[in-house]
């Protein structure tokens, strides 16, 4: 099966590489504008130049394109703990990312926050933190796990998910979530 | 065994408000990132809001920031959503999940759902 493809890849593919068609005239390809520019004008005729205007300030494009507007930079979220790792150019959006010992947790395909790794009080690293993973930590004895963070049995109740952590018998108690709350 | 049951949905005209409700049991509440997920119908599930254990942080989506006030009761085990001048792309069903942080999107457990129309 032959993928469905949309009108301007349709265009594009009568073309080689680097090049698209005209759109008002099928007969003309005209060079795509390198990166960090956009299409003002196209070319008049085969053979002749694309007019290609470098992104204004605040605005790129990162591959060739015939785009006739650069694209906005994106602007990292304070309110969600983001800070910007390298600035926006002409030709690569800002980058954004979390600061040293926190992780991201995404809420959304391009949407994250920034939480701050577990340090594993009362318990030992058994992974590392990492960009978009928290510590995972193991309890020392007479601690369990709650939310990645080791806690004292003695705040565990009767009939709560850390009952089977917090057994006198068990002498090691080691920390996993209870399967039923994941 | 955890049970998430949400209550409150309903056909609203748009511009009108409802509010969302979710009884947790089965696990120790207040220890937890509570929040709303939704699923459209045709579309992929989406965080809305979500709140961490002491109420003191909060998420919204961009979609719904300023119309829709996430808040919990502890005592109760109960997790709201308040939401008001609704749009007919609000139209969905509406899941209480337990959020699992890290790496993601992920929607953790959740509830059954409660539907939400927004229609004249």
């Known amino acids: 099966l032959v993928p469905h493809l949309g009108d301007r890849e349709k265009r594009d593919s009568v073309c080689p590489q680097g090049k698209y068609i005209h759109p008002q005239n099928n007969s003309i390809c005209c060079t795509k504008c390198h990166k960090g520019t956009y299409l003002y004008n196209d070319c008049p005729g085969p053979g002749q130049d694309t007019d290609c205007r470098e992104c204004e300030s605040g605005s790129f494009t990162a591959s060739e394109n015939h785009l006739r507007h650069c694209l906005s930079c994106s602007k990292c979220r304070k309110e969600m703990g983001q800070v910007e790792i390298s600035s926006c150019t002409v030709d690569r959006d800002t980058v954004c990312g979390c600061r040293k010992n926190q992780y991201r947790h995404y809420w959304s395909e391009n949407l994250f926050q920034c939480f701050n790794c577990s340090l594993c009080l009362n318990g030992t690293v058994h992974l590392s933190c990492q960009e978009k993973q928290n510590t995972v930590c193991t309890c020392h004895a007479g601690f369990f796990l709650r939310e990645n963070e080791c806690v004292s049995c003695s705040n565990c109740k009767k009939s709560l998910e850390c009952t089977k952590l917090c057994l006198p018998q068990i002498e090691n108690v080691k920390g996993t979530e209870d399967s039923g709350t994941t | 065994e955890v049970q998430l049951l949400e209550s409150g949905g309903g056909l609203v005209q748009p511009g009108g408000s409802l509010r969302l409700s979710c009884a947790a049991s089965g696990l120790t509440f207040e220890w937890y990132w509570m929040g709303w997920v939704r699923q459209a119908p045709g579309k992929g599930l989406e965080w809305v809001s979500a709140?961490?254990?002491?109420?003191?942080?909060?998420y919204y989506a961009d979609s719904v920031k300023g119309r829709f006030t996430i808040s919990r009761d502890n005592s109760k085990n109960t997790l709201y959503l308040q939401m008001n001048s609704l749009r007919a792309e609000d139209a969905a069903v509406y899941y209480c999940a337990k959020v699992k942080l890290g790496g993601g999107p992920n929607f953790g457990y959740r509830g059954q759902g409660t539907l939400v129309t927004v229609s004249s």
């Open positions: 709140v961490s254990g002491s109420g003191g942080s909060t």
